[in-house]
Structures are given as C-alpha cells and as structure tokens.
C-alpha cells in the first residue's frame, strides 16, 4: 500500500486508479495515506470517475477516510438515491491526515477506466466552526498558517487552557455607604474558569447590608451543594454562601463594616449572574432639637455616622457654644452614636454700647442700656455750638452687630462745630479802636512763638493764620503756643492748644511779599466749642457781595495800639473795604516795590487812617457778617501795610480768603 | 472704669505650684456674658493662652498645659484664681489675666498689667 | 491649630501697612488682633474680625477670609511701631499667633 508524500515535504499530489486512463483490473485494492503538517488539512478532489455501481457501492469503490470517519464511499460516475459519484465535489479531511481506499471485486460487467484525483494541504481554519458547535475561542479567535490562538478583551485574561477568557475581577474595594457590585457581563452570561473577589470596606461604626436584586442564575447541581460555580460571602464574623441555582438569596445583614464577597465558575455553563444592592446603617445619633430661633439642616428622619447638621440661626440671632460665639456650626455623628458638638444657642445679636459721640450724647430709645437686635439709638449735637452732619442721628442695632443708620452708614455721624456766632451786633458807622467784649470775637487765636500773632479757628482742628506770621516754626510745629478763649493777652484763664503740623502755602516766598500770605496749623487735639471759642465761617461762593468797596469788614487783635504797645486786652476795628486800584496806586510809590499789592489780597481801612491793624495782628481774621445765614466768616488775613500802621492814604492790606477755598479744603481734607 | 490686677509670687522654685489671683473691678464675675482668660508671655516670646473661666463656671485650659493648670473663681471677691503645678524654668513669663466677652467674640478688650514670675531654684 | 504671621512687616509714615495671619479655614472662626509695645500689656485693635474697639484710630481696619485674616493699618504713624499678635479660638481654646514687628521707617 503505497504512502502519499510525508511532511514536512509538498504536500500536494495526484491519484489515479492503476491502469488509468486505461481500464482497472479486477481483485484491485490499493491504499494511500495522506499527511499534512499539524494545522494543516488535505484537500481531495477528482478530475475523472468511472467506476462499477453497485449497491451501496459493495463491488467497486473508492473510500475516503479521516482517522476513524469514513467521509465517502464512491462509486458509479453519478450519484443516485443510495450511491454516490464524487462529481465536482471536493472533500476535506478532518484531521491532517488522509486515506483513500481504491478497491475493484472479481468481475466488472463492462470496463470501467477508474479515476483521477489530485490533492493539496491547505491550512485549517480554525475559528470557522459549524453552526451549533461550540466557538474554538471565548472572546477572539486569530487564525494563521499552521494553527490559531486565543486573546480576551480588556479586563479578562487568557486561561492556561489557551481557549478560555477568566475575568479580572479580584481587588476591587467598594468603599461608599451604599453602592452595586454584579457578576462580570451582568445581565450576560458570567465568565467561565474566574475567581472574583470583592471587598466592601466601610469606616469603622457601619454595618453593610446586602440585598440580592433583579435575578440570580449561577449554575447548580440538583444532588450536590454548588459544585461547579459559587457565590460566597465572608466577613469577620462568620461566612454566608455558598449560593447558586436561581433562587435570590435573603437579605444580608452583616453587622460588620467589611466585606468580601468571591465568586467562581468552572468551564462549563451559560448562566447571568447576580446583581448586589449594599447599603450601611450604624448606631443612630439623637435626634437633633433646634435651639430657640434657630433651625436645623438637613432634615432627615435619623442621623447615622457621618452624617452631619448645621445650625442656622434666625436673623438678629447668632450662634454661642458656650459664651463664645461662632460663624458657622455642623455637627458631625460619631461612631459611639454621639454627636461630635454640643448644640450651640441662639443668642440675640448685641451691638454693645454705642460709641460716645464727641460733642454730642447718645440716648436710647428702645429702653435704657437696651443694645441688642433692632434697639434704636438717637444720637444729638449740643446744641448751639454743634450742629449734625451727614445724618439724622438715628441708628438701628442691625443683624451683623453693627449700630447703623437709616442710610445704612456704620461710623458715628459727626457734630461739627457751628461756624460764626459772635455775642457781638454789628452798627453802620466806624467807631475807633474798641475793647472786645466776651463772645464778640470765639473765633480769635493766640499764636506766641517767638513773636505775637493772630489766628482764626476752623472747625475744632484747625487755625487760618498768616504765612508770614509762623513761617519760622513750619518745622517745629510744637514750639507753636496757641492760646483760646480768652480776653486778656497775658491772663493765665485760657484754653491751651498746640499744633501738630503747619501747612504753609507752597506759592508763598518769605522777605519777598505778600503774595499767598496764608497758612494753616492742624490742632493736636480738638477744642471744646463753647460761647468763648467758636470758629469762624469760610466765605461762600456768594460771599463776594458782602465784601464789595466800603463794605465794612471787622479786624481784631492784641497787636499795636496808638500808643506803641501790644494790646493788654482784644480789640477790634471796624473798617471799609478799599477799592482794590485805588489800594494798589497808593503803594506804587517808593519805598513799595512795584506789584506789591496782587490779586490775592484786598486792602481795607480809611484814607484819613487812624483805624487800622498792626503788629500782632498778624494772621487774624477781617471778618464779615453775611446776612443772609446771620454768621460771620473769614474774608481776609491780616497780612501787610504802611510802615507806621493807620497812616492816611494808606491802607492795611489782607489776604484774600475766598480765593484759597480750594487749596484750605484740600489740606483739612488730606489731613 | 473696668480693670484688672494680677497678684502672685515673683520667684517659684522648680517643681513648686504657682497660684496667681486677678482681681477684677468695673465688672462682675457673674456677668453671664463676660469672662477671664490668663496668658502668658515668655521674655521675647509670643502670648500664649493658658485658660479661661466664665460666669456658669464654664472653664477650658490649653490642651499642652491641660494637666498642670486649674482655674476658678471667687464672684464675691471679684477674684479669679490660676494654679500651675511642677513649675519648670521654662514657665518664666509675663503673666495677663484679661476680660473676654460675648460681645467681641471672645476678643480679650481689658488687660491686667502683667505679673512676672521667675521659675529659678 | 497653628496661626501663622510674618515675623516683620515695615512701612513709611503714611503708607499702607498689611499684616496677615492664617490658619486652616480660618474664615469660620472670629480672629482678634491686639498691639504690644514695648513693656505694656496688649491692647485689642479689631474683635470679630473687623471691628474697632472704642477709642482706637479709624486707621485700623480688619478682614478675614477663606484661610487668611488681614490686619490693615492705613496711613501709617510712628506712634503704630509695635507688636502685633492676631487670636482666634478653636473648640473652646485660644490660640495667639507668633506675633508681627511692625516697623514705621
């Protein structure tokens, strides 16, 4: 029986019947065995067939077989209900081997020329399998020359068996309070030859509960306890499981705050699995009762670990735990069932005392000493001498603590002196130089410091003065004596003030006129404004029309007198107004240097002289009445004049206030 | 007026327990919405808070000194007394008895002048 | 609870000057801060974070946010050369910071 050729050499080749194309002899039989290389199968097919019918082919036929298959026993030269013909079939072997049988009986009724076959190896497709078969791979299959091989998606890995995909299941750690774990695919078949193991793992204090959900199929056995797939759930306590079948397992109820649960499955079985709602519980926190004006959030019908609450206080409340008080509160419960915060109060929000309002007093409307939530508080200036700005002194205890007014400010409101009240009435005719009387002049300041000088309060802060007059102590402000209040130039009865800084006017140049004449000293301290010490007014933008030629304007001061010597007592003089050419010819003339008499100044005085101001006047105010508001303001500063004071044609000369409005608020403001 | 006034030893040996009084005036211990801290201050050093008690006898001691302090009070003599056990040289400082109140939120708004105590055997 | 301020802070007169101080979510609690000079006890500047005691200047202003609390002495004077130390309390302690130089040039 001759072999086919043996791999590893071409696997390819012809058969014929012995004699063909001529015709078989009887009492033939003749064997060839095919090889093909492993993967590898044969592929037969025939290119002439002619051979005795017979029934079931007994007499002549050619036998294909395949290991222990017989794939076809032919005969005839076509195929009828019981043989059959090869035709333009072509046939595979199973394996990688092939036999083929020719045999011929003892007598042919006519001749019969046999058959011509050829045959190839060619390579096996593996992952091609019938339908109903099972697949050669789990997930993929990849077929090449020679053979195939196995791979798995991503989460899954290729078993030793080389075919099957087990899951990657095992390390996962749930760890929320509640949560879902399933079979891998779940609803889809589980994976075959995998062991999963899950972990539950929960703070300290919970319990995991298990609820098996929607379906349970894990393969079974009718006589023996889950022996091919299992589901088993251990904790530290004790183990539940195994479980399979179809039935879902009861609720679980751990008491342990650990879990793990392993699953395995053999190679067999087409089952979905199992699907695991967990939730936790743990021992309760009481009840949280809201304090008085206050409420709690969130609401929940119980409080476990780790739940929490805030308390929130109504407005005009805030929280106290214990006597200090607090932004914000939460509570959070603990593993022992108690809360980690007592509960705070809620307090009334108190505003405390108001401030004292300088000049002024605070009264309490609500109640004496009543400073908590919604009191009302009415402050007032004293009166005469103060009057209130910015508000109407009114102020509300608010829910952030704050006393605040009506328009919503925080900060006190302000008693800010009356400006220009003088005891004195002003008469139509010019009278010599007279005493002052008590109140005629509150306004009038005391500046020694080397010489004697004159200036004017402003506010309760500051002194208009001359620049001429302090310029010596612009760097030592301190050394300035600044004396109020009183009549008497050297009584020891006085209000004493000192200064903090002197601004002198940067267009002001000393020994080289008066142009700028004008400075003022910021007080240390604010003086008490009473009937003696007043501070004068600032001109108006309307004030020009008090202040026109002949319009008489006020000065005072302790400086010269006729008879050459400072004044023991204040005086004060009222002149006319200058027209402002007329001033300014009379001292073009030598020895005045040209221009000496400038826009910023306005000169005052009577051409037959006699009433002027003088030496130690320096710095004090020419003021005037507007009697439109009844209050006297500052229209100018004594600052120059004739050599011998109250010479005729000649006049004093004064710095012209409203033209620095500007530059005096600018410094009060800044400073 | 309200003020407060330390009063105590000057010099402690090691070991030894110091008991320091503040006497308060201008306000009652019994204020339920005031109270007295003590605090310390080491030469050169930064205040340190040591404990403080209010009206209902609610105390409360740093956590590091827990052990060695014990405060209390005496409303009818306005006095609110600290001891400090096992003085160590460590312990010298400046000691403050100060007011707190609901009001300022715990804001200490009057202070003693400060004892000095020296731990030195 | 640890607060934490810059060892020193300086500033010319009439300028602005900043001290922080900070701590964990230190914007829920009240901080307080208090000025020491040389040899006196200390003095309360702001209480509940912004507000000023009676009688101290209106230069002094307070915030607090988030982890830090800000001490702001605008226009600043000679007379403001000190220490300054913010407090806080947490769980019913108090708790000083290290306290900041402040140096007026």
């Known amino acids: 029986t001759p072999l086919g050729p043996k791999w590893p050499e071409p696997v390819f080749g012809r058969l014929a019947s012995p004699g063909f194309p001529g015709e078989y002899a009887n009492d033939q039989e003749r064997r060839w065995t095919l090889t093909a290389p492993p993967g590898y199968r044969l592929r037969l097919y025939f290119t002439h067939f002619d051979l005795e019918l017979s029934h079931l082919c007994e007499y002549d036929f050619v036998k294909l077989s395949s290991g222990a298959k017989v794939l076809a026993t032919l005969c005839g030269q076509e195929s009828t209900d019981t043989e059959r013909a090869p035709g333009k079939d072509t046939f595979y072997s199973l394996g990688s081997s092939l036999d083929i049988t020719f045999r011929s009986d003892y007598s042919n009724e006519k001749p019969f020329t046999g058959f011509e076959a050829f045959y190839a190896a060619e390579d096996i497709d593996e992952c091609q399998v019938a339908p109903g078969e099972a697949p050669t791979c789990d997930h993929h299959c990849h077929n090449h020359l020679g053979g195939f091989y196995c791979s798995c998606r991503a989460g899954y890995v290729l078993h030793r068996n080389k075919r099957t995909c087990s899951a990657l299941c095992s390390g996962q750690v749930f760890t929320q309070r509640s949560g879902e774990l399933s079979s891998p695919e779940y609803p889809r078949p589980y994976p075959k030859l995998s062991s999963c193991t899950y972990s539950i793992s929960l703070e300290e204090g919970f319990s995991v509960i298990l609820d098996f959900v929607e379906s349970f199929d894990v393969e079974t056995h009718p006589e023996t306890l889950c022996p091919y797939d299992f589901l088993k759930i251990q904790t530290d306590r004790e183990e539940h499981g195994p479980f399979c079948g179809k039935t879902l397992p009861h609720r679980i109820e751990t008491k342990s705050n650990t879990v793990t649960i392993t699953f395995v499955t053999d190679e067999s079985g087409d089952h979905t699995g199992w699907k695991i709602h967990y939730t936790s519980t743990a021992q309760p926190c009481p009840y949280p009762m809201a304090p008085p004006n206050g409420h709690v959030s969130p609401v929940q019908a119980k409080y476990i670990l780790k739940d929490s609450f805030s308390i929130f206080c109504e407005t005009g409340y805030e929280l106290l735990q214990g006597h200090l008080p607090l932004k914000s509160f939460t509570a959070v419960c603990q593993k022992d069932g108690s809360w980690d915060r007592p509960m705070p109060a809620c307090s009334i929000v108190d505003c405390g005392p108001p401030d004292d309002l300088p000049s002024g007093r605070v009264e309490y409307i609500t109640g004496p000493g009543v400073t908590t939530y919604k009191a009302v508080i009415q402050y007032s200036c004293e009166e005469t001498f103060y009057t209130m700005k910015v508000n109407d002194g009114k102020y509300v205890c608010e829910a952030d603590g704050f006393w605040t007014s009506s328009k919503g400010e925080k900060s006190l409101p302000v008693c800010e002196p009356v400006c220009g009240l003088s005891a004195r009435t002003t008469g139509g005719r010019i009278y010599g130089g007279q005493k002052a009387k008590p109140g005629d002049f509150p306004w009038q300041v005391l500046i020694l410091g080397g010489t004697t000088a004159a200036g004017a309060l402003l506010y309760d802060n500051w002194v208009l003065t001359a620049a001429h007059a302090v310029y010596e102590q612009k760097h030592d402000a301190s050394a300035l004596d600044i004396r109020m209040g009183t009549l008497k130039r050297l009584s020891p009865h006085y209000t004493q003030a000192w200064s903090e800084a002197v601004f002198i006017h940067e267009g002001y140049t000393h020994d080289a006129g008066f142009d700028n004449d004008i400075a003022l000293i910021k007080l240390n301290n604010k003086v008490v404004i009473n009937s003696n010490i007043t501070p004068i007014c600032l001109p108006r933008k309307e004030a020009e029309s008090f202040m026109r030629t002949d319009d008489i304007g006020t000065a005072s001061g302790w400086g010269l007198t006729q008879r050459g010597f400072l004044a023991r007592n204040l005086m004060y003089v009222d002149i006319p107004i200058v027209d402002h050419q007329k001033c300014t010819a009379a001292y073009e003339k030598p020895p005045y240097p040209r221009g000496s008499v400038t826009a910023n100044m306005l000169c005052a005085g009577l051409e037959s002289g006699g009433k002027d101001s003088c030496r130690g006047d320096s710095g004090g105010a020419l003021v005037f009445l507007d009697s439109e508001t009844e209050r006297w303001f500052v229209g100018g500063i004594v600052s120059w004049g004739s050599m011998n004071c109250g010479e005729a044609g000649q006049y004093g000369v004064y710095t012209k206030v409203i033209n620095y409005i500007p530059w005096i608020e600018n410094i009060i403001s800044d400073f | 007026q309200v003020t407060l006034k330390e009063s105590g030893p000057v010099l402690v040996k090691p070991t030894e327990t110091l008991t320091l009084t503040c006497t308060v005036s201008?306000?009652?211990?019994?204020?339920?919405?005031?109270?007295v801290s003590w605090i310390r201050q080491p030469p050169g050093k930064a205040l340190e808070w040591l404990a403080h008690?209010?009206?209902?006898?609610?105390?409360s001691y740093s956590t590091s000194l827990k052990s060695r302090l014990t405060i209390s009070k005496d409303t009818s003599k306005s006095q609110v007394v600290l001891t400090m056990t096992n003085m160590d040289p460590v312990d010298t400082a400046t000691y403050y008895c100060?007011?707190?109140?609901?009001?300022?939120?715990?804001?200490?708004?009057?202070w003693g002048q400060g004892t000095t105590v020296t731990v030195s055997s | 609870y640890v607060l934490t301020q810059p060892p020193s802070v300086s500033a010319s007169p009439g300028q602005t000057a900043s001290i922080t101080c900070s701590g964990d979510?230190?914007?829920?609690?009240?901080v307080s801060w208090y000025q020491q000079k040389p040899g006196r006890s200390p003095v309360l500047v702001i209480y509940?974070?912004?507000k000023r005691p009676s009688g101290i200047p209106e230069r002094f202003s307070g915030s607090n946010y988030g982890n830090t609390a800000t001490l702001t002495i605008s226009g600043t004077q000679a007379v403001d050369e000190a220490d300054y130390y913010c407090?806080?309390?947490?769980?019913?302690?108090?708790?000083f910071g290290g306290g900041t130089k402040v140096t007026v040039l």
């Open positions: 100060a007011r707190m109140a609901i009001l300022t939120a715990g804001g200490m708004d009057v």
């Open positions: 201008g306000f009652s211990l019994s204020n339920a919405r005031m109270g």
């Open positions: 008690i209010f009206s209902n006898d609610e105390k």
């Open positions: 979510k230190l914007g829920d609690k009240y």
């Open positions: 509940r974070d912004t």
């Open positions: 407090q806080a309390w947490d769980s019913g302690s108090g708790v």
